[in-house]
Interface confidence: medium
Amino acid sequence: RSTEQGESCSGLLGADAKLAGNTHQHIFNDLSGSVSLAWVGDGTGVILALTTFQVPIFMITIGQSKLYRSEDYGKSFEDVTNLINNTFIRSDFGIAIGPENSGKVILTADVSGSHGSRIFVSSDFGKSFTHQELPFVPLMQITYNPENSNVLLALSNKNELWLSEDFGTNWKKLYDTVCLAKWGRKGTIFFTANHNGSCSNDRGMLELERTTDYGKSFKTVASKIYSFGLGGKFLFASVMTGKGTLRAIHVSVDDGDTWNMAQLPSVGQEQFYSILAANDDMVFMHVDEPGDTGFGTIFTSDDRGIVYSKSLDRHLYTTTGGETDFTNVTSLRGVYITSVLSEDNSIQTMITFDQGGRWTHLRKPENSECDATAKNKNECSLHIHASYSISQKLNVPMAPLSEPNAVGIVIAHGSVGDAISVMVPDVYISDDGGYSWTKMLEGPHYYTILDSGGIIVAIEHSSRPINVIKFSTDEGQCWQTYTFTRDPIYFTGLASEPGARSMNISIWGFTESFLTSQWVSYTIDFKDILERNCEEKDYTIWLAHSTDPEDYEDGCILGYKEQFLRLRKSSVCQNGRDYVVTKQPSICLCSLEDFLCDFGYYRPENDSKCVEQPELKGHDLEFCLYGREEHLTTNGYRKIPGDKCQGGVNPVREVKDLKKKCTSNFLSPEKQNSKSNGSAGGSGGLNDIFEAQKIEWHE
């Protein structure tokens, strides 16, 4: 393991008494069927809880909502339903919280059968609400301009695009027959519209429009659009190619002023593209395989989003529910976990530590046996349960968890064998970003990270009522239990403030007596368990991505290594809300590993050298870039996006402007070759799928 390990477990003295004095019960006099929670602002302690009870009758839904507000991280709640005039709030739109610490909140009322709708808005963290009538019925949650929370964008159920510049008081209609709309950078709005049809048919005949002045003027930036997506600095559009039903990805890095065709396989009607992750450096793109295979290929882009390297074959991404296990491990740079579908249809977990350059199986946890799925009892891997397992209703209550401020920590359900098993999983933890793993808890659990990793909290997943919470102050090595109530509750969820900086955890559930059930929450503050602030002596230096301490280049990933100050496992102290991860980067010498293969080149398997594609040998590498024909002089390498290496290997690369006008057709389907692209990809979800903080764009 990466940091010091394993003193024998001895419980913290007086923990029960300390926690008992910091456990706050709140019983809601409420029989509603569902509850949604939202934290308003960062570090404010304000939580809004919306309970909803609804019954569908014929074509309409009737119901009631109650709104509760806490100012102390959930220790107590006040019923503030009167602030929303006892109106039924649409739970499917949730509670729309404004960006940053704006304190803004929008609740959308359900006004069944009317031509308009109503919203309740707050600018003071939910202390007070005013209601505004809408001249339309929203199709989805109203969205804030990320840079100006007074400006709101909404799509109506008649596919009209509406905008308000005064936080919902006044609205103006911007456009008709709008199929999809998104905020871009600096108040830019992108949307697809069909000028002579509807959104339900004619996919592929849409115009991509842009407005930079809140709808005073519009510019058509692309035509024959199937769908579009934004990721990092990139604007992607899937465009019909003119070859029947094929479509291809075009990319822009200047908000649609200029476009280039991405070096990716075209896809047919029943396939899809999906941006799995994107930042300002690069993008992970999934291209679905033809046929209903349930898998496709992951490609990683260069810094322009134009040239792509094949990253991973047989990547699991089902058509049916649009499920993929692709997970960004936010606790360590460059690490991603996902699943592949083997030839025998079993699912195996793969991990990359270098942003998709190489993928490997997860190392078998030292304290675990290979299960009976393993052909060889001494050689097997850890396989992680994520979205796909959850969608298949396996006994997996939570997806993998990592937090940027809990450096190196990854928690996930898994099984140890040759492939994912349907058997009841256990919970595993890595403290080094996924290089090594340990079984942390037997059986399925809910888990959360508090105080930037200083405390991990877990609750057993059970169909029976529960009253025990488990916690660990040493990154999951040793666990203590605390009975938070004498009367067990039917558990529905763990809630802690996003960002993993809080020391409060709320346990939500309901109590059931002979005739009634009611919501109840228990909020536990761990501040007295971590009774002192951490000092310098509580931290130790840790080199991330270290696999061979003898090697001078040990820890080098994407051209630099990082040393972190990590909390010692033996230290029981508070990182605190203001904790900032301390890291010291150092630049590495360049090697071929720091370069991807340039246009016209590919890497043979298990080789770090890029070789010329046979069919392009001896040809001038001319291609179209920004509307001019370019001549590329290269020995086959281009630096990986975000790679900071210096010195060492330095392959020559030069692009000459051939001063000829051209159009982006260097990747018309007949010129594509599978050497660098792999095969094109499988069966397609035709609806856009939005998965918050996960999949950036699914066509």
């Epitope: 046929g291 209903d292 295979t293 349930g294 699991l316 089902t318 579908l341 030839e343 025998d344 249809n345 079993s346 699912i347 299960d371 009976a372 799925t373 052909k375 796909y388 298949q392 396996l394 064998g417 994912i420 098993s421 349907v422 058997m423």
Partner: antibody
Framework: EVQLLESGGGLVQPGGSLRLSCAAS????????MNWVRQAPGKGLEWVSA????????YYADSVKGRFTISRDNSKNTLYLQMSSLRAEDTAVYYC??????????????WGQGTTVTVSS | EIVLTQSPGTLSLSPGERATLSCRAS???????LAWYQQKPGQAPRLLIY???SRATGIPDRFSGSGSGTDFTLTISRLEPEDFAVYYC??????????FGQGTKLEIK
């Protein structure tokens, strides 16, 4: 409705050949591994052969290895078993079964009605 | 090669009684990959249980499966007349890819 329908069985002499077919309907054929299972008169079930969804991987019981060939045509939703060098002990009802779908093994959840192969002189 | 041995070979019970059928593997089998089938005369087998304990679609809840490692059990809590048949256990994933037990005949007493 999910269905498998075998055909091609019959009487054949020892050393002879026969090709069994299995037409699938009601599900996405290419997403599933497929199997042949046989049952000799008055005996239990014996797995014969399996093939992956794409057709890229094939598997055989030792008793038929080198004599039987499993294949599939996903465009026609059809599974095949080419049997050669047939022996008296290959006499059985041959069932086509649906095997593993994406991800988890859910048993052989769909069976055909069976086709009878008799090897006799 | 994994050998599955079912016991008893024949089980004679009356409707309404409880039936317990056993399947023992010669070496450890993943519970994920153990299934039970029912076969009536002149019919194709029908999947009852997969993953050692999960009931297949449409199977009544009087059928249940349990066990792990080398010992697995199929239980029919209250026998109905239509339950009298031959029952096979099956493992998946080792070499050979599938192995069936020799079967247990459940007959009316």
């Amino acid at each position: 409705e999910v269905q498998l329908l075998e055909s091609g069985g019959g009487l054949v002499q020892p050393g002879g050949s026969l090709r069994l077919s299995c037409a699938a309907s009601g599900f996405t054929f290419s997403s599933y591994a497929m199997n042949w299972v046989r049952q000799a008169p008055g005996k239990g079930l014996e797995w014969v052969s399996a093939i992956s969804g794409s057709g890229g991987s094939t598997y055989y019981a030792d008793s038929v290895k080198g004599r039987f060939t499993i294949s599939r045509d996903n465009s026609k939703n059809t599974l095949y078993l080419q049997m050669s060098s047939l022996r008296a002990e290959d006499t059985a009802v041959y069932y086509c079964t649906r095997g593993r779908g994406i991800g988890y093994y859910n048993g052989m959840d769909v069976w055909g009605q069976g086709t009878t192969v008799t090897v006799s002189s | 090669e994994i050998v599955l041995t079912q016991s008893p070979g024949t089980l004679s019970l009356s409707p309404g009684e409880r039936a317990t059928l056993s399947c023992r593997a010669s070496q450890s089998v993943s519970s994920s990959y153990l299934a039970w089938y029912q076969q009536k005369p002149g019919q194709a087998p029908r999947l009852l249980i997969y993953g050692a304990s999960s009931r297949a679609t449409g199977i009544p809840d009087r059928f249940s499966g349990s066990g792990s490692g080398t010992d697995f059990t199929l239980t029919i809590s209250r026998l109905e007349p239509e339950d009298f048949a031959v029952y096979y256990c099956q493992q998946y994933g080792s070499s050979p890819m599938y192995t069936f037990g020799q079967g247990t005949k459940l007959e009316i007493k």
